[in-house]
């Protein structure tokens, strides 16, 4: 029962992670313009994402522009896009694998195979978490590096956007959920069936036998 509870918690966490990852990838808030200096009132804020950039005026009006050419984009942005999409697809694959092996489904009947599928889904979710973490950490590193680089002018300096925090949360949830799914499975492949057998034999009705008829190997 505890194992089933952990599985449900694990998959709920990974689903939350997947949604967070999707929002993180989609929102144009990876980089936010950093206006340094206390003597000025900034008229606009620029948000930059993987797919578009947005300008928010002081009036609250927002204008977004989707990046035109794929080939004209910086390589790190192209890589971040690719990793984000791959991470989301990998997590979806992990979910399908989990559903095939979940205790409450009948796709696979054999308990050993079910356990292996849940374990596999956990590993897949962990991989998805790592794939989500790479572009987020890479972008954060680039922002921080440029922020403290004396060669970079203020207009080119950026701050960490909300999408990065969502990305970290998504990665954490996928890693945690995947880890929980890995932990719900028995460590040895053959332990599962013998565990069920032991439970079955203890609950079987006792038959009166002579003392010599009891198999001695059952006693430790």
């Amino acid at each position: 029962m505890a194992s089933a509870g952990m599985q449900i918690l694990g998959v709920v966490l990974t689903l939350l992670g997947w949604v967070n990852g999707l929002v993180s990838c989609a929102l144009p808030m990876w980089k936010v313009t950093a206006f340094i200096g206390n003597s000025i009132v900034v008229a606009q804020v620029v948000w930059e994402g993987l797919w578009m950039s947005c300008v928010v005026q002081s009036t609250g009006q927002m204008q977004c522009k989707v990046y035109d050419s794929l080939l004209a984009l910086p390589q790190d942005l192209q890589a971040a896009r690719a990793l984000c999409v791959i991470a989301l697809l990998v997590a979806l694959f992990g979910l399908l694998v989990y559903l095939a092996g979940a205790k409450c489904t009948t796709c696979v009947e054999e308990k050993d195979s079910k356990a292996r599928l849940v374990l596999t889904s956990g590993i897949v979710f962990v991989i998805s978490g790592v794939l989500t973490l790479i572009p987020v950490c890479w972008t954060a590193h680039a922002i921080i590096r440029d922020f403290y680089n004396p060669l970079v002018a203020e207009a080119q300096k950026r701050e960490l956007g909300a999408s990065l925090y969502l990305g970290w949360a998504a990665s954490g949830l996928l890693l945690l959920g995947g880890g929980l799914l890995c932990c719900t499975c028995p460590s040895g492949g053959s332990q599962g069936p013998s565990h069920y057998m032991a439970r079955y034999s203890t609950s079987a009705p006792a038959i009166s036998r002579g003392p010599s008829e009891y198999p001695t190997k059952n006693y430790v």
């Epitope: 200096g37 004396p150 080119q156």
Partner: antibody, heavy 119, light 107 residues
Framework: EVQLQESRPELVKPGASVKISCKTS????????LHWVKQSHGKSLEWIGG????????IYNQKFKGKATLTVDKSSSTAYMELRSLTSEYSAVYYC????????????WGQGTSVTVSS | DIQMTQSSSSFSVSLGDRVTITCKAS??????LAWYQQKPGNAPRLLIS???SLETGTPSRFSGSGSGKDYTLSITSLRTEDAATYYC?????????FGTGTKLELK
């Protein structure tokens, strides 16, 4: 006293390369970025690029990318700018300048090196 | 790139005059502006940064003002040593760009 001492004037043939030096003194070399500025005769100033002597990081004006290469020698507190495949439009005075610590303006300048490209 | 325009390329001025040199940026540079003085045969010298802050050694007769795209350098009671070319420079964005220059000549 902060000083930036640039190398002697250069007369080079078209297509050739030139390497200008800028020897600094009077401050900690690695604490300030160094920049190069071009001034053609009777014209305005043009920023070429800058270098961080601490780690060798560079930034270039797109116009001079592939034309200018900025380097430093920390042991001698000297900055260098190499200009290659020169044409007559690169005949100018080249200044090295130190970036001010709080703003991206140049607070100390070298005396300038005159480069003449002529056959 | 941000273009910096100094509308007057030269001024003919008299000693004691008050002079105002203007500089216009092609976009908002948020006060990230410096003014330089250059005398013939010499390197430029930084006078003002942050649009208004006088550098150490800059005489108090010099002052800077402006915001957004428009900035000015003012010199009250002009002196002989002020005859030079003045350049503005934006450092809001790279590439750093300089104004076209304004030459002050004494009458």
């Amino acid at each position: 006293e902060v000083q930036l001492q640039e190398s002697r004037p250069e007369l080079v043939k078209p297509g050739a390369s030139v390497k200008i030096s800028c020897k600094t003194s009077g401050y900690t070399f690695t604490e300030y970025t160094l920049h190069w500025v071009k001034q053609s005769h009777g014209k305005s100033l043009e920023w070429i690029g800058g270098i961080n002597p601490n780690n060798g990081d560079t930034i270039y004006n797109q116009k001079f990318k592939g034309k200018a290469t900025l380097t430093v020698d920390k042991s001698s507190s000297t900055a260098y700018m190499e200009l290659r495949s020169l044409t007559s439009e690169y005949s100018a005075v080249y200044y090295c300048a130190r970036r001010a610590i709080t703003v991206y303006a140049m607070d100390y300048w070298g005396q300038g090196t005159s480069v003449t490209v002529s056959s | 790139d941000i273009q910096m325009t100094q509308s007057s390329s030269s001024f003919s001025v008299s000693l004691g005059d008050r002079v105002t040199i203007t500089c216009k940026a092609s976009e908002d540079i948020y006060n990230r502006l410096a003014w330089y003085q250059q005398k013939p045969g010499n390197a430029p010298r930084l006078l003002i940064s942050g649009a208004t802050s006088l550098e150490t050694g800059t005489p108090s007769r010099f002052s800077g003002s402006g915001s957004g795209k428009d900035y000015t350098l003012s010199i009250t009671s002009l002196r002989t040593e002020d005859a030079a070319t003045y350049y503005c420079q934006q450092y809001w964005s790279t590439p750093l760009t300089f104004g076209t220059g304004t030459k002050l000549e004494l009458k």
